[in-house]
Interface confidence: medium
């Protein structure tokens, strides 16, 4: 599964949209979790409403908000007031019982100060592909990676 690398500015909001097959994932809740390591579990940050028909309602945990458009097949996660500590590897997941199917892997990077490094334009160069592999972002730049990681729990 490809990993999309998204960059946001500290203090701003970062919005991630993970797309999925609406029919295949009919009735399933969605979750946003943080993968701590190769062997470790994915630590749940926030999940959509417990009643699937109400999944369009925003659910918040701290500064992270999730909402699911089940008809369009798009789950949207917003990281508000982005901080350096929010940087990390995350997953959009579709939940079925105790099983979690990974919809998208997202590596979040936080740019602390737009004026901090005048070579930032050289450092964060987008990959050749401009495709977001099913994840889109606002208020950020992004570079798409071809990373394939081993399965995680």
């Amino acid at each position: 599964l490809n990993t999309t690398v998204l960059q946001g500015m500290a203090g701003q909001s970062l919005r991630v949209s993970c797309t999925y097959d609406a029919l295949k994932h009919w009735g399933r809740r969605k979750a946003w979790c943080r993968q701590l390591g190769e062997e470790g579990p994915c630590q749940r940050v926030v999940s959509t409403h417990g009643v699937w028909l109400l999944a369009f309602l925003k659910k918040r945990n701290g500064s992270t908000v999730i909402a699911d458009d089940t008809l369009a097949g798009t789950v949207t996660i917003t990281l508000k007031n982005l901080q350096a500590g929010d940087a990390g590897l995350y997953q959009c997941q579709s939940l079925r019982g105790r099983e979690a199917e990974v919809l998208q892997k997202v590596l979040v990077e936080v740019l602390e100060d737009p004026l901090d490094d005048q070579d930032a334009g050289d450092l964060w160069v987008p990959e050749e592909s401009s495709s977001f592999e099913g994840a889109q972002v606002e208020h950020s730049t992004s570079r798409n990676q071809e990373t394939s990681f081993p399965p995680t729990s």
């Epitope: 690398v5 993968q35 940087a87 990676q145 990373t147 990681f149």
Partner: antibody
């Protein structure tokens, strides 16, 4: 077992060039970001450069930007560091390291190769 | 760039002692911190990632804690093989900055 074996170090004059190699085995090389980290004699660790698993994006410390080039050949399971315009302050042991998922933490390291820049 | 400062720079202790090494970030880094151990003439080894997660094969006497700007590495009962230099490192945001190191010596 993960193994990283660096080579190519040696003595070079200021302004000269050197290419380091790192042969990787024991894991699917093409799935992982890789990096170079150096350590000057008696000093601490300094990250030098990283690149993505595809090699499509590269990252450099300010101290080497424009002089060093990181690259990889996934078909040969090998990581490279081309070092040009070498300075005395580049003298260090250079370690090749496997980086987990673009995180910047290095879970496996090579034994290092010494680069000495001196006239 | 965020700076990482370790204290103390060096530390003398005895086998069986409980030892704590601290690392301070110049800005909030959440839990994005790793710890490494390095013995003379050897490559560093990853001990702890994401503040408190022990890497594969790391003994349970090593533990990490903290959040934000202040972090600690604790060795609950020093063993002879633990005498080494320890480095903290800020992760997940380039440049990957290391602390200056803490040398743990035998008293």
């Amino acid at each position: 077992e993960v193994q990283l074996l660096e080579s190519g170090g040696g003595l070079v004059q200021p302004g000269g060039s050197l290419r380091l190699s790192c042969a990787a085995s024991g894991f699917t090389f093409s799935n992982y970001y890789m990096a170079w980290v150096r350590q000057a004699p008696g000093k601490g660790l300094e990250w030098v450069s990283s690149l993505t698993n595809s090699g499509g994006s590269t990252y450099y410390a300010d101290s080497v930007k424009g002089r060093f080039t990181i690259s990889r050949d996934n078909s040969k399971n090998t990581l490279y560091l081309q070092m040009n315009s070498l300075r005395a302050e580049d003298t260090a042991v250079y370690y090749c390291a496997k980086e987990w998922a673009g995180s910047g933490y290095f879970d496996y390291w090579g034994q290092g190769t010494l680069v000495t820049v001196s006239s | 760039d965020i700076q990482m400062t370790q204290s103390p720079s060096s530390l003398s202790a005895s086998v069986g002692d409980r030892v704590t090494i601290t690392c301070k970030a110049s800005q909030n880094v959440g839990n994005n911190l790793a710890w490494y151990q390095q013995k003379p003439g050897k490559a560093p080894k990853l001990l702890i990632y994401y503040t408190s997660n022990r890497f594969t094969g790391v003994p349970s006497r090593f533990s990490g804690s903290g959040s934000g700007t202040d972090f600690t590495l604790t060795i609950s009962s020093l063993q002879p093989e633990d005498f080494a230099t320890y480095y903290c490192q800020r992760i997940y945001n380039s440049p990957w900055t290391f602390g200056q190191g803490t040398k743990l010596e035998i008293k």
